[in-house]
Interface confidence: low
Amino acid sequence: KTLVLGKEGESAELPCESSQKKITVFTWKFSDQRKILGQHGKGVLIRGGSPSQFDRFDSKKGAWEKGSFPLIINKLKMEDSQTYICELENRKEEVELWVFKVTANSDTHLLQGQSLTLTLESPPGSSPSVQCRSPRGKNIQGGKTLSVSQLELQDSGTWTCTVLQNQKKVEFKIDIVVLAFQSTAITAYKSEGESAEFSFPLNFAEENGWGELMWKAEKDSFFQPWISFSIKNKEVSVQKSTKDLKLQLKETLPLTLKIPQVSLQFAGSGNLTLTLDKGTLHQEVNLVVMKVAQLNNTLTCEVMGPTSPKMRLTLKQENQEARVSEEQKVVQVVAPETGLWQCLLSEGDKVKMDSRIQVLSRGVNQT
């Protein structure tokens, strides 16, 4: 018995060959002997029932002269899975058709971190194995249900699932979109008084949802809400905002948050949550603030916010050797010389932040 694998919604070609390689009488039947179609000697295709009942069934007239009499079944349904009989030259050829379907759980748009389940629907009597390959080449194998946990942004794209049955295979392509922020964490390095802008681009255009930025200043031991907002038809509206910050949220996507003037007290870390119909996305936000000030006879450079232990704070007169350089968050120079001083926050040879101050004369207070 010949086996043919098909995909729901597509077409299958069931073979039937004559040994004489020429046109001959043939008939295709269901296993219950109901006639589907055939050719009875006049080169005309005769259908076994009404056109509406048999319009999905066809043959390839062009192949008849070569002794080939295939049965074409279009718009395949799961219930087309059965045995078909081709009668020609006083013999019967049996062809088994199995129609398969692969579907993704609930939706093909999933959030980063969620699980993807691919399910194979198969006809009774079949014993398929499934192997699915992600856009990145990741291979997963199994029976009729396959699961991938902790989806990553890079899992977006076309997943190719190969159904294997009796050494034959059929391929399915499923487009999966992993919804995510385009970066895992954002850090802004700013001098006191500057404005800070955070942009949160998504890898998709989300129509509706709501979000909140919870913030924990370095000096605080708890998170507090800074701003809450909603997204409707790609428009962003502020619901609540901390008044003393004068936060500005752009009205259009991508989500863009601006702090007009940062100060040391704002430095810290935040967590932006965006709640959509499908679940919640998280984005880490960090703000590092630098302040250089001269008070009495001392020049101080201070940094607050989440810095790494490898970061170095350097206070020096411009175009001169470093006066103070420490792996800590505050550096001071007593009785600084008059002139332009700069404070640098660096990691290795990469400068993260640079703030300058003009020292006019010793003992003058200025910030």
């Epitope: 390959r133 080449g137 190719t160």
Partner: antibody, heavy 125, light 107 residues
Framework: QVQLVESGGGLVKPGGSLRLSCAAS????????MNWIRQAPGKGLEWVSY????????FYTDSVKGRFTISRDNAKNSLFLQMNSLRAEDTAVYYC??????????????????WGKGTTVTVSS | EIVMTQSPAALSVSPGERATLSCRAS??????FAWYQQKPGQAPRLLIY???TRATGIPARFSGSGSGTEFTLTISSLQSEDFAVYYC?????????FGQGTKLEIK
């Protein structure tokens, strides 16, 4: 700057084992998918294996399946390739490479942009 | 496995002239396609990804085109440092595969 440095290559007899290492620096190693690619003397390039950023997703080319094992230690910024049951046809320069991605009009494009200088593996009796 | 076929195997061109290298995939790879340059004793260097996007730091004289199964790398005005072996690469299906290489020589 971004750097990948392979080590662990050498001369080994057929059936022997070697463990290649790749030390990464200048970038957040745990954010990137990593790969091993090889090049036999005077020949073209062949993809050997890749591993996801988390280390959960691993794939090998057919010729090394069951013999080679790719792994990573994100805490130590290191990528490894354990090669067992080595054959003469495994003789090659082995490159460690980082897979990058860029986005354009909401689509993501992947490419292997950063390569190490390579380490030579010779399998001979 | 997708087979990548490069032509010609070798190409002799004078400095300042244009060079055109071709690559054909045995099946569609869409735009998941790259070109690499390799000099003796060195690792491959990415020139083009996504079929036509120049990698960071690659001069504008290098350009890629094509989609599906037919791809072209054009070097508009050859410099002495451009003489090397060029590989095409598909990353649509695993295993990722390379062409056999085209050696670009000084005429």
């Amino acid at each position: 700057q971004v750097q990948l440095v392979e080590s662990g290559g050498g001369l080994v007899k057929p059936g022997g084992s070697l463990r290649l290492s790749c030390a990464a620096s200048g970038f957040t190693f745990s954010d990137y998918y990593m790969n091993w690619i090889r090049q036999a003397p005077g020949k073209g390039l062949e993809w050997v294996s890749y591993i996801s950023s988390s280390g959960k997703t691993i794939f090998y080319t057919d010729s090394v399946k069951g013999r080679f094992t790719i792994s990573r230690d994100n805490a130590k910024n290191s990528l490894f390739l354990q090669m067992n049951s080595l054959r003469a046809e495994d003789t090659a320069v082995y490159y460690c490479a980082r897979e990058d991605y860029s986005n354009y009009e909401d689509y993501y494009y992947y490419y292997t942009g950063v390569w190490g200088k390579g380490t030579t593996v010779t399998v001979s009796s | 496995e997708i087979v990548m076929t490069q032509s010609p195997a070798a190409l002799s061109v004078s400095p300042g002239e244009r060079a055109t290298l071709s690559c054909r995939a045995s099946q569609s790879v869409s735009s998941k396609f790259a070109w690499y340059q390799q000099k003796p004793g060195q690792a491959p260097r990415l020139l083009i990804y996504n079929a036509s996007t120049r990698a960071t730091g690659i001069p504008a004289r290098f350009s890629g085109s094509g989609s599906g199964t037919e791809f072209t790398l054009t070097i508009s005005s050859l410099q002495s440092e451009d003489f090397a072996v060029y590989y095409c690469h598909q990353y649509k299906n695993w295993p990722y595969t390379f062409g056999q290489g085209t050696k670009l020589e000084i005429k």
